[in-house]
Interface confidence: low
């Protein structure tokens, strides 16, 4: 079928415009072109016989228009008044007769539009602006664009007049933005320059910083004051309500007591007429005196006495601070405040205590702190300790004794041998030790201030023979996988070697064992039941050796998984069912039985007499280890048979 | 002289991270509260955060809550506010002040280091 494509089929005045012919019938004699959308002879633009390759033009012929050979036709520089229908006429070499029609719209070129506004100065919160999209066009679409994006939705914002015009009523100040409009119509698009709102507004209230209200005598004051406004907001200062100066900072320097008031700042907006006003207090502290701490009682005796340390000067309407350790109060129940906090009481004073103690006078800017206080805590003597820690001492050697108590002042010693009085000092030395020096040491510590004595014995055997060692154990009853245990060769003797043996044989090589203490603890790690053997300890020196009676370990393990015999699980109907169980479990364990979940009887042994099938079922042996703690259990399926139905199955007896 | 001194600021983007400094002279740190105040155009004065060493509190604006630290070592007489997981309202220009312990009343500013959080 004859058909007619326009491209483009939207055509901007100007330019031009191609009327394409599709399936052009074969055997032509010629075609004409008509205006219209019927064949006219008044409106023919153009006819064309294919003989003679002759264009013939008609009444409509406008000297824009160009015939193809192939019928197609193109209109160039396009006007207004080339829109509408063109029709096609085409003459077969039978002289039938073929039409077609097309058609093509024109629309002009945009000009660049531009924005017109009734208001170029608007009141914030009280005028509305209108802008309008000049010029008026026909068939052209407007659009508006604000900072280059398309309106937000907002009740305040108004498009009237086919969107020629858009209203911003209520104008606020974040309306200030640049503002754009385009036309738009099937051939071009424009935009407009942008537009800036300007919109008045403010002065707000105004803020004065700092915001810092205290200061001390001597320091300068310099305030600024800042309102929102446009255009910029004029300033001026009073103080107590008396006008100072108009400007923006207000500046007195090495202020005094005097100075303390209220400051107010006014802001003024010319062109909205409006002021407002924001007014802070100011307030002038003198110069505190720097505090320093007394003390009830500079010697406190540790347990006994209390302390309470005041911080001076008393100042009325004063915040007071305390640290210790350079900490703030820890909350304790042996430390009190005061309800001014000016005294701080240490109930009960250890030697913990000493401090050291500030106190602190805060003002409104910063605190004024005291020089710090150490208490002298009275204490001691703790019981004293007498090294070396060696009991067992060789003839012939020098005895050295050293004796060391806590105290506060430091303790005086005193030493005494078989409850004779030696010497007062904190060292013993006695040479060339022989066996009548054996005997029972005591060290006698002395606190002069609080009065108190402690004391400490230790026994000193001098002698060539070694003494026969024994084991002791820090763990005598220790858990499988879990505990460790540590065995210690007793006593300490100087100048001696400690030899181990665990089953008559000397000590395996293992990275559980570990020797510590110049060999005198063996320390055995997450021990084992097969650690529970006979463990033997020895001491030697140059002169003899001895050793120890064994110590057997006992460790306590399981119970392992239980094992249920006769491992048999199917019975005749008649016999007697006997099953035993046993896990393996250091200390025994506790055995109980559960048929079908349903507990039984708590032995070692179930017996049940002339089963029948109602006998069917889950059997479930329970274990426990009081001492371990640990649980375990089996559960085995028994099936009873009708007499006769089981071939080749025992029963249990 | 009470001197203030920051530093630490610059260009980061968001999500990143800074620390800045206030170096004190002329007073004990320990005595008194230090703050950070921000500055930016178009926003109000902003107490971020603040630092009492000597009854130890530390107080936030709860637009920095969980992203601001404030701390402050007494040995170097520094005060320090590391800012994690920054935003692009964090712009600003920070000053180290003097704070008073209960109210946002700042003294003794310093110069100001500025903070740029951009992409």
């Known amino acids: 079928k004859l058909t007619i494509e326009s491209t483009p089929f939207n055509v901007a005045e100007g330019k031009e415009v191609l009327l394409l012919v599709h399936n052009l019938p074969q055997h032509l004699f010629g075609y004409s072109w008509y205006k219209g959308e019927r064949v006219d002879g008044n409106r023919q633009i153009i006819g064309y016989v294919i003989g003679t390759q002759q264009a013939t033009p008609g009444p409509a012929y406008s000297g824009r228009e160009i015939i193809y050979p192939n019928a197609s036709l193109l209109i160039q520089n396009i006007i207004q008044n080339d829109t509408g229908f063109y029709t096609l006429h085409v003459i077969k070499s039978d002289l039938v007769n073929e039409e077609a029609t097309g058609q093509f719209r024109v629309y002009p070129e945009l000009p660049k539009p531009s924005i017109s506004s009734n208001n170029s100065k608007p009141v914030e919160d009280k005028d509305a602006v209108a802008f309008t999209c000049e010029p008026e066009t026909q068939d052209a679409t407007y659009l508006w664009w604000v900072n280059n994006q398309s309106l937000p939705v907002s009740p305040r914002l108004q498009l009237s007049n086919g969107n020629r015009t858009l209203t911003l009523f209520n104008v606020t100040r974040n309306d200030t933005a640049s503002y754009k409009c385009e036309t738009q119509n099937p051939v071009s698009a424009r935009r407009s320059d942008s537009v800036i709102l300007n919109v008045l507004y403010g002065p707000d209230a105004p803020t004065i910083s700092p915001l810092n209200t205290s200061y001390r005598s001597g320091e300068n004051l310099n305030l600024s004051c800042h309102a929102a406004s446009n255009p910029p907001a004029q300033y001026s200062w009073f103080v107590n309500g008396t006008f100072q100066q108009s400007t923006q900072e207000l500046f007195i320097p090495n202020i005094t007591v005097n100075n303390s008031g209220s400051y107010t700042c006014q802001a003024h907006n010319s062109d909205t007429g409006l002021n407002r006003t924001t007014v802070t207090t100011i307030t002038v502290y003198a110069e505190p005196p720097k505090p320093f701490i007394t003390s009830n009682n500079s010697n406190p005796v540790e347990d006994e006495d209390a302390v309470a340390l005041t911080c001076e000067p008393e100042i009325q309407n004063t915040t007071y601070l305390w640290w210790v350790n350079n900490q703030s109060l820890p909350v304790s129940p042996r430390l009190q405040l005061s309800n001014d906090n000016r005294t701080l009481t240490l109930l009960s004073v250890t030697r913990n205590d000493v401090g050291p103690y500030e106190c602190g006078i805060q003002n409104e800017l910063s605190v004024d702190h005291s020089d710090p206080v150490i208490l002298n805590v009275l204490y001691g003597p703790d019981d004293p300790t007498i090294s070396p820690s060696y009991t067992y001492y060789r003839p012939g050697v020098n005895l050295s004794l050293s004796c060391h108590a806590a105290s506060n002042p430091p303790a005086q010693y005193s030493w005494l041998i078989d409850g004779n009085i030696q010497q007062h000092t904190q060292e013993l030395f006695i040479s060339n030790i022989t066996e009548k020096n054996s005997g029972l040491y005591t060290c006698q510590a002395n606190n002069s201030a609080s009065g108190h004595s402690r004391t400490t014995v230790k026994t000193i055997t001098v002698s060539a023979e070694l003494p026969k060692p024994s084991i002791s154990s820090n763990n005598s009853k220790p858990v499988e996988d879990k505990d460790a245990v540590a065995f210690t060769c007793e006593p300490e003797a100087q100048n001696t070697t400690y030899l181990w043996w665990v089953n008559g044989q000397s000590l395996p090589v293992s990275p559980r064992l570990q020797l510590s203490n110049g060999n005198r603890t063996l320390t055995l790690f997450n021990v084992t039941r097969n650690d529970a053997r006979a463990y033997v300890c020895g001491i030697q020196n140059s002169v003899s050796a001895n050793r120890s009676d064994p110590v057997t370990l006992d460790v306590l393990y399981g119970p392992d998984t239980p094992i249920i015999s006769p491992p048999d699980s199917s019975y005749l109907s008649g016999a007697n069912l006997n099953l035993s169980c046993h896990s393996a479990s250091n200390p025994s364990p506790q055995y109980s039985w559960r048929i079908n979940g349903i507990p039984q009887q708590h032995t070692q042994v179930l017996f049940i007499a002339k089963i029948t099938p109602n006998n069917n079922g889950t059997y479930a042996c329970f274990v426990s280890n009081l001492a371990t703690g640990r649980n375990n259990s089996i559960v085995k399926s028994i099936t009873v048979s009708a007499s006769g139905t089981s071939p080749g199955l025992s029963a249990g007896a | 002289e009470v001197q203030l001194v920051e530093s630490g600021g610059g260009l980061v983007q968001p999500g990143g991270s800074l620390r800045l400094s206030c170096a004190a002279s002329?007073?004990?740190?320990?005595?008194?509260?230090i703050g950070w105040v921000r500055r930016a155009p178009g926003k109000e004065e902003e107490l971020v955060a603040q630092i009492c060493q000597y009854h130890g509190s530390t107080r936030y604006a709860d637009s920095v809550k969980g992203r601001f630290t404030i701390s402050a070592d007494t040995s170097k007489n520094t005060a320090y506010l590391q800012m994690n997981s920054l935003r692009a309202e964090d712009t600003a220009v920070y000053y180290c002040?003097?704070?008073?312990?209960?109210?946002?009343?700042?003294?003794?500013w310093g110069q100001g280091t500025t903070v740029t959080v951009s992409s």
């Open positions: 002040a003097i704070v008073g312990q209960n109210y946002p009343v700042y003294n003794y």
């Open positions: 002329g007073f004990n740190i320990k005595d008194t509260c």
